[in-house]
Amino acid sequence: QKPSIGKCSVDIQQNRTKTTERPDLLNCPIYWQQVQEKCLLFSHTVNPWNNSLADCSTKESSLLLIQDKDELTRTQNLIHDKAISFWIGLNFSLSEKNWKWINGSFLSSNDLKITGDAKENSCVYISQTSVYSEYCSTEMKWICQKELTLVRNKVSPDSWL
């Protein structure tokens, strides 16, 4: 299963003032799900890792990057079926002999505990409970991410109601 998806809109201005400019809103695009400061989009089909990476690009997004254990837990809490796996934006760099995020940074040893081999053509996926490596050619669902974007709307104060 995957989570229900609702519209995301977070008011980041604590004190509204009487002005013709609406408070700044952080918005996820339609169909995307807000999780903390990110917007996530769960695929409804399966692909090898490379195709998943490319498909996120068509949505002006990237495969999911996980910053720490807390973010991993938050994401795993959205996966309601233990049998479903999702590619994330982490694969093994043979030249550097290390796990590398698609933004170019390397996996720090205390970020994620990956079960499985660290070798050529290995990519990383998450399930409800764990983080695994698997051949990048394996077909799986995947998760895309975008950063929340700031939107300013000029409207009358009445429309805040």
Epitope: Q1, K2, P3, S4, I5, G6, K7, I30, Y31, L41, F42, S43, H44, T45, V46, N47, P48, N51, D55, K59, H80, D81, I84, E139, K141, C144
Partner: antibody, heavy 120, light 107 residues
């Protein structure tokens, strides 16, 4: 325009297998995931599984995982659903249906349906 | 599995009538709900996605609404070609499920 044309009705005996085809036209066959759905008499529609024609990757409803095989032949833009070890409760109309978007689970085009009857 | 319960199962109405069909989910599905129309012996046709977004080419008399667990499909002014079966579907989970359908008949 997008068209999904399915093979004709089948009558099978319990324990046998059936293979239903779905020929696609009017769009890039490898660009859209194909799903299979069935409707047994007096029952709700039931989702069976999907196949990505570009890669051959599949994902199945656990209920059918052991008995169904989804395949494609991209050279003739055709998807196939094979169901084995047929039982009488597999009697149903089987539909192929195109997934409209990689990130949403709606079906924007359907085949006309193939009636499969399982009877001894 | 998420169950979808449609009501009514049968509906008799006249050309020009406004009709509403309801789909209730056994748990929260957000807005990941779809509506289809199906005529006898024909393939289902997509009407509404994401609870309220009309598919390309669908007449404006068809509208969808709702979120969470309760959804409606409304036809504002019935036309002769609208008499058909209608069913809902959820994709909030990867095990897609469907409602039992509503048969809309001419009164």
């Amino acid at each position: 325009q997008v068209q999904l044309v399915q093979s004709g009705a089948e009558v099978k005996k319990p324990g046998a297998s059936v293979k239903v085809s779905c020929k696609a036209s009017g769009y890039s066959f490898t660009g859209y995931t194909m799903n299979w759905v069935r409707q047994a008499p007096g029952q709700n529609l039931e989702w069976i599984g999907l196949i990505n024609p570009n890669t051959g990757g599949t994902y199945y409803n656990q209920k059918f995982k052991d008995r169904v095989t989804l395949t494609v032949d991209t050279s003739i833009s055709t998807a196939y659903m094979e169901l084995s070890r047929l039982r009488s409760d597999d009697t149903a109309v089987y539909y192929c249906a195109r997934l409209g978007d990689n990130y949403r689970g709606y079906f924007d085009s359907w085949g006309q349906g193939t009636t499969v009857t399982v009877s001894s | 599995d998420i169950q979808l319960t449609q009501s009514p199962s049968f509906l008799s109405a006249s050309v020009g009538d406004r009709v509403t069909i309801t789909c209730k989910a056994s748990q929260d599905v957000g807005t990941a709900v779809v509506w289809y129309q199906q005529k006898p012996g024909k393939a289902p046709k997509l009407l509404i996605d994401w609870a309220s977004i009309r598919h390309t080419g669908v007449p404006s008399r068809f509208s969808g609404s709702g979120s969470g667990t309760e959804f409606t499909l409304t036809i504002s002014s019935l036309q002769p070609e609208d008499f058909a079966d209608y069913f809902c579907q959820q994709y909030s989970t990867y095990l897609y499920t469907f409602g039992g359908g509503t048969k809309l008949e001419i009164k």
